[in-house]
Every structure is written in C-alpha cells, then in structure tokens.
C-alpha cells in the first residue's frame, strides 16, 4: 500500500488531523521535499544577520552578515568581523600583512608580491601591504640613463614577520 503522504509535494505537509490531506505550509514555514508530515519554521535573520533570500513555502530563508562582517559556517550560522585591506585574519585576529605580502580585500589571506624579475621585468611601483608591486618594462628595454625603482628586498616567508 502506498503511503498517501508521499503524494504531498514540497510546500505542503501531510495533515494527520485532516485524513492525511496535503495542506499548505502555514505562514513562516516551509517544506523543501515532498511527503513531509510537518513544515519547518523559517529561519529569521536578526541582529548581525540580514536576509539574503526570503523564506518561501518550499525553501528556507538565507541570511548573510551586515556590512563589516562576513559569514562563517554552513548557512551563515555565525558572523566574523572583516579585516582592513593590508591585513589577514589569523587565529590571533586581524594581523598586518608580513613584509613582501599584500591583501587588497577586507577578507582572505595576504599573498606574496609579484616577482617581476621572473618575467624579466623591473619593478615600476613598489608593493605595499595593500597593493601588489607594479612591474614595468624589462631593464633591457629601458633607454640608457633611465632608472627603475630599486627592487624590494626579498620577501620573507608569510607568517614570519617580526613581532
């Protein structure tokens, strides 16, 4: 015998109080699969969480974090403070990029400056904690007497800056 509840589509529930009729999910609830005997309560995005996608009868609401914070966890269960440009989030919180690395975003990790000499180019603009170096023409391409910016000192390995 087929379970009559298996005919109930997403967005409904199998109502035992009404002879297993498929009833629509009540307001602020949803069922994302068919054959469910209850609808789940919609997530509410409150406080530091804001609504990215409204709840519907067939799918839960989705939250993200207010500006200055970013999501952690499955379904954005926690919010974590953004760092500034020129920093990365470590286990000790926001830390400045080590010499020879940069981060031009408010999240993510510091990345090594481009090594211009690998492409046979010179450094046109030095790198900073917030910006990569800008590579210029190769030294051979420079006209006699033209000078390039002194290349930066070799980058230390990330994570080994003096404290």
């Amino acid at each position: 015998l087929q379970d009559p509840c298996s005919n109930c589509p997403a967005g409904t529930f199998c109502d035992n109080n009404r002879n297993q009729i498929c009833s629509p999910c009540p307001p602020n609830s949803f069922s994302s699969a068919g054959g469910q005997r209850t609808c789940d309560i919609c997530r509410q995005c409150k406080g530091v969480f804001r609504t990215r996608k409204e709840c519907s009868s067939t799918s839960n609401a989705e939250c993200d974090c207010t500006p200055g914070f970013h999501c952690l966890g499955a379904g954005c269960s926690m919010c974590e403070q953004d760092c500034k440009q020129g920093q990365e989030l470590t286990k000790k919180g926001c830390k400045d990029c080590c010499f020879g690395t940069f981060n031009d975003q408010k999240r993510g990790i510091c990345r090594p400056w481009t090594n211009c000499s690998l492409d046979g180019k010179s450094v046109l603009v030095n790198g900073t904690k917030e910006r990569d170096v800008v590579c210029g023409p190769s030294p051979a391409d420079l006209s006699p007497g033209a000078s390039s910016v002194t290349p930066p000192a070799p980058a230390r390995e990330p994570g080994h800056s003096p404290q």
Epitope: G47, G73, A74, S77, C79, E80
Partner: antibody, heavy 116, light 107 residues
C-alpha cells in the same frame, strides 16, 4: 571599545519581580541581538532568551517563557530583562551578552538574591 | 533541545601541563561550537568560536578542534592565569545550550 555594563545587585522577596539593565557602548546597539544567560551559585550557564534591538522581537527559553520579558530602549542603547514571580531558585548571577552566533562580549553580571 | 556533555567536570593540573577538555553534543552541531572562560570573579570571556577560531587577544596556547558531535579545547602549556572554569556552548539551534563546565584547578 565594545562594552556592556549591567545594573547593580538586587535582593528580592519570593513572588516579586526584578528588572536588570544592560547598557551597551562602543558599537551600534541596534545591529546585534542581545542574549541573557544566568548562573545559579555553583552551577553552569543557562540561556534565558534574546532580543533583537532593531525590532523588539524576542526568543525565550521555554523554561522561562511565562515569567520573563525582554525589552530595550534604543535611545539609550539599553536592554532589559525582567523576571517575575521570583522563587528562591532564581537566585543567580544574570549576564547579558552580544551575539554574532557566539557571545563575543559579556556584561559583568548582576547578582539577584531571592530571599524571604 | 541539544544536550551538551562536557568532561571532565574538574581537573587538577600544573603550570606547563597540556590539558584537553571535551564536549559532546546530543546531535550534529556542524562546528557551531564555542568555548568560554570564567574566572573566579565571575567575568566570562569568549575564547574560541566556530570550533577552532581564536577570539581576538586570546593567547595561541588555546586551540579548538572537532566536528559533528565531538569537540575539544586544548591548552598547550598551562599558565597561572588559565586556572578557571571553561564552558562549551552550541549555536546550532535555539535554545542555545552550554556544557556543565570544567573547573581547572592547580595541582
């Protein structure tokens, strides 16, 4: 810096009510839920509920649902927790805490003693 | 409600010791696990959030790990200021629930 400062200790008789305040500073008060947690003497931490300062919406622990009321006054960045029909086993330290999915900042705690 | 079982409930250790506290949830909490420290004066401080992320200003001797239902807090080399009570807490579902606490005492 971000800080939560709670009101002072209270002594109440059984059957009375108590209202504890929690004043926030150093951040946008309306942008973060405020939760309340209590700790009876020698016991662990117990979550009581939360309020969204933006809307005034609340979530309460079923255990306290009929006795607790959480409110806020956004003009003075203050959250309140009122517990009614006090019993001797409500003697505890009551904490407020800011929420990011974890409680990153806590108030210093308010001791409420219920004694006849 | 999600039950959080913390062990041991008390622990004696010496300065320099490595200490591990465990927390078990009654269902999968998908890494939504936080650890707090409470000093004898009553002040509560966040140590670790989302299983392993160290809160700003917390010394790196503290670390967290785990997944599913089982989580641990490790202090790699105990310092005198670490003798306190530690609580785990789940953020997976309301009501938020805490472990019973682990009191860390000087041996």
């Amino acid at each position: 810096q971000v800080q939560l400062v709670q009101s002072g200790a209270e002594v109440k008789k059984p059957g009375a009510s108590v209202k504890v305040s929690c004043k926030a500073s150093g951040y946008t008060f309306a942008g973060f839920e405020m939760h309340w947690v209590r700790q009876a003497p020698g016991q662990g931490l117990e979550w009581m509920g939360a309020i969204d300062p933006k809307t005034g919406g609340t979530d309460y622990n079923q255990k306290f649902k009929d006795r607790v009321t959480m409110t806020r006054d956004t003009s003075i960045s203050t959250a309140y927790m009122e517990l009614s029909r006090l019993r001797s086993d409500d003697t505890a330290v009551y904490y407020c805490a800011r929420d990011l999915g974890y409680f990153d900042v806590w108030g210093q705690g308010t001791l409420v003693t219920v004694s006849s | 409600d999600i039950q959080m079982t913390q062990s041991p409930s008390s622990l004696s250790a010496s300065v320099g010791d490595r200490v591990t506290i465990t927390c078990r949830a009654s269902q999968d909490i998908r890494s939504n696990l936080n650890w707090y420290q409470q000093k004898p004066g009553g002040a509560v401080k966040l140590l670790i959030y989302y299983t392993s992320r160290l809160h700003s200003g917390v010394p790196s001797r503290f670390s967290g790990s785990g997944s599913g239902t089982d989580y641990t807090l490790t202090i790699s080399s105990l310092q005198p200021e670490d003798f306190a009570t530690y609580f785990c807490q789940q953020s997976e579902k309301l009501p938020r629930t805490f472990g019973g606490g682990t009191k860390l005492e000087i041996r």
